[in-house]
Amino acid sequence: RSTEQGESCSGLLGADAKLAGNTHQHIFNDLSGSVSLAWVGDGTGVILALTTFQVPIFMITIGQSKLYRSEDYGKSFEDVTNLINNTFIRSDFGIAIGPENSGKVILTADVSGSHGSRIFVSSDFGKSFTHQELPFVPLMQITYNPENSNVLLALSNKNELWLSEDFGTNWKKLYDTVCLAKWGRKGTIFFTANHNGSCSNDRGMLELERTTDYGKSFKTVASKIYSFGLGGKFLFASVMTGKGTLRAIHVSVDDGDTWNMAQLPSVGQEQFYSILAANDDMVFMHVDEPGDTGFGTIFTSDDRGIVYSKSLDRHLYTTTGGETDFTNVTSLRGVYITSVLSEDNSIQTMITFDQGGRWTHLRKPENSECDATAKNKNECSLHIHASYSISQKLNVPMAPLSEPNAVGIVIAHGSVGDAISVMVPDVYISDDGGYSWTKMLEGPHYYTILDSGGIIVAIEHSSRPINVIKFSTDEGQCWQTYTFTRDPIYFTGLASEPGARSMNISIWGFTESFLTSQWVSYTIDFKDILERNCEEKDYTIWLAHSTDPEDYEDGCILGYKEQFLRLRKSSVCQNGRDYVVTKQPSICLCSLEDFLCDFGYYRPENDSKCVEQPELKGHDLEFCLYGREEHLTTNGYRKIPGDKCQGGVNPVREVKDLKKKCTSNFLSPEKQNSKSNGSAGGSGGLNDIFEAQKIEWHE
């Protein structure tokens, strides 16, 4: 594979002329300090740009906002500030875009010093706005019911929960002293409330409430709550155990009607739980270590969210600021990347290809030298910079990037050695979901994926003004440069429509002349670089997770393998906005790898067999499930959630109802009489950090 100066790279003929004819400059007559962008709808071409200039004076902030609207993917903008009556919009709330293609937009105004507030709402993709007075001051961005965009939920700065069923025209107060509120499935609202205190002092004494009728009635589904989170089909709550300051995780898969205790370690006051990722099959849970270690343990759940298997030790997750590098590689099923804090306090990257079953180091890129962190100059790994490096102000402009429709592609900053290096990183690319890597660009860059992987665009990260963009049509093997302006600009960001289906990229920045600066954007349309639509001959069959072509189980992950039709690297053509990933699954035979260890069992390191936990040997395996004492007959295995294997190895498993009552419902956790308290289930974990970056839940 070649990089920028690859010998085998020949440039696309006439690329500069084609791009020059498709480069659109827009100068904003605007001196504002910040700009936020939002795409309204999918494939509409509508972008809203909100610029904000604000100055804090004593206890209030005064400022000015301008609103601009584009209907052509950012090629031109119209100043539509008059639509919002020249009102100062709170930039911390951003632009709230409605779900799906509803065309709804909410802007929250800053009405300093008043008891109420004002919102501007649009139902026509920002063409027109009407303003509505709010009888409260929002504490955070108003949220839409994901299934009905007319229904809005808001938490006020006095911790009142408010609801509107008519897109903000009328509001009713649902509840007082609400600490956290979230939309569940089918219009359900979950929230924690403190009936006799405040949110700040009394965490751990909260009630978890549920309403399924927009606040006409409420049901208390749990008590003594510290925090709660939703992930996939699971509702999690961290609950005070009655043993002083300890908390435990409880889980429900029926919206809180019944609960079970998760087989995870309890945590103390200084620790936390965090859902790193969740879907309808399973959850990744981080459990913080005691003390200020900056790491914890990742556990993966069974399909009920009850039994957990230890997945990864010493997982980096700082309590200060709550930074973790945990990343779902969305371009390949089952792949996740994260960082561990090793014994010598260096940070190393780990990757799993089987949904947390096994973690390994990233393979060293070919043609890369091991850096100074490597003890052995011939043996080292690639280490990826993600959120933690960014929080440490390393020269890392972007987190790792992958897109579901750009199959197999992962782009990230990294260094090659025994651990993450503080030296200036380079950009690496994988075209097979993280199995193999190649250095793509020298030094730090901003990057984005266009046309479902048909084009990758990059801009060098520099403190100096820039005027050159780089692009590749062969998944980062060969690069061409294009000078998009004669007058370099101070670059602030690359913007492309979410979903990586667009062929337009906007370069945002500002120009500086004596005493003034103004915002400028350059939008480049690559449609003429990819002149024709891709045809059948442009695609080739690619087997995901292939590690050994001679093995007839090659590519089998979670019980099935997938063959994809992927664009040939040599094909320069448009996938197009309507491109749908073509994949063909085939079922694999079951092996022990397709099973996790059941309740009361664990896997010794480097062994695929599950063995009985010593402390449970000779004991009946009885545990509390849905309020009944259950007796488990098992040889130690339970199928991994989402695993589709058939035939092959088939361990026997049977659960018998012992017809005995027991309580795992933590509405009264002190009555818990199940024999399975603690971490008998292969030890497991959860997280009460529910809102950190893309993390599903952090306490």
């Epitope: 059948e536 069959i541 087997l543 292939s546 072509p549 001679e550 093995d551 007839y552 090659d554 590519g555 393998k561 997938e562 063959q563 063909q584 699954p585 085939s586 079922i587 694999c588 035979l589």
Partner: antibody, heavy 120, light 107 residues
């Protein structure tokens, strides 16, 4: 020219043994998985056995498991099939076939076949 | 085991006519389906691999399509030399299996 040539077939009594050989030429034998496929008179094709390039993966059809043994000698560019406890239903033309280098690839090169007759 | 059902078993066709042979798998095999031609008293020869990829040296009148469970081999304009048995073969799952074959005869 890429070529596979089978030998070792013949007439054998039920319960008897036979060893088939396949000589490869014209390609890097040690880089490919190899297979035996058979065809009973007037019938279709039936896969018998498979061996990976370094012999780490060996697979058999249920009908021959425990009776047939596949092996290879990369130094001699040769593939073998040791057939024991032969039955009348093993009567067929036995083809040696190379598997392409891709995952789940096809049999891209076939030998001319050698006839095995099991009869008393 | 994955069963491959080929149809028709037999086809008598005049030259220049289009021939279509189908192969149905008992469960999804992705694109891991290959087609072979076997002329009388000869060994099989690979025509199409991975459902639609023509093998080198195979005349362009032979084409394949399909994925998952349903596959088709098409001979666009039959020639006399195409009289043979045609077999589909799946390599997705052990045991490897072949279809029962389709015998194409020239009228």
């Amino acid at each position: 020219e890429v070529q596979l040539v089978e030998s070792g077939g013949g007439l054998v009594k039920p319960g008897g043994s036979l060893r088939l050989s396949c000589a490869a030429s014209g390609f890097t034998f040690s880089s490919y998985s190899m297979n035996w496929v058979r065809q009973a008179p007037g019938k279709g094709l039936e896969w018998v056995s498979s061996i990976s390039s370094s012999s780490s993966y060996i697979y058999y059809a249920d009908s021959v498991k425990g009776r047939f043994t596949i092996s290879r000698d990369n130094a001699k560019n040769s593939l073998y099939l040791q057939m024991n406890s032969l039955r009348a239903e093993d009567t067929a033309v036995y083809y040696c076939a190379r598997r392409g280098s891709g995952s789940y690839d096809a049999f891209d090169i076939w030998g001319q076949g050698t006839m095995v007759t099991v009869s008393s | 085991e994955i069963v491959l059902t080929q149809s028709p078993d037999f086809q008598s066709v005049t030259p220049k006519e289009k021939v279509t042979i189908t192969c149905r798998a008992s469960q999804s095999i992705g694109y891991s389906l290959h087609w072979y031609q076997q002329k009388p008293d000869q060994s099989p020869k690979l025509l199409i691999k991975y459902a639609s990829q023509s093998f080198s040296g195979v005349p362009s009148r032979f084409s394949g399509s399909g994925s998952g469970t349903d596959f088709t081999l098409t001979i666009n304009s039959l020639e006399a030399e195409d009289a043979a048995a045609y077999y589909c073969h799946q390599s997705s799952s052990l045991p490897l299996t072949f279809g029962g074959g389709t015998k194409v005869e020239i009228k």
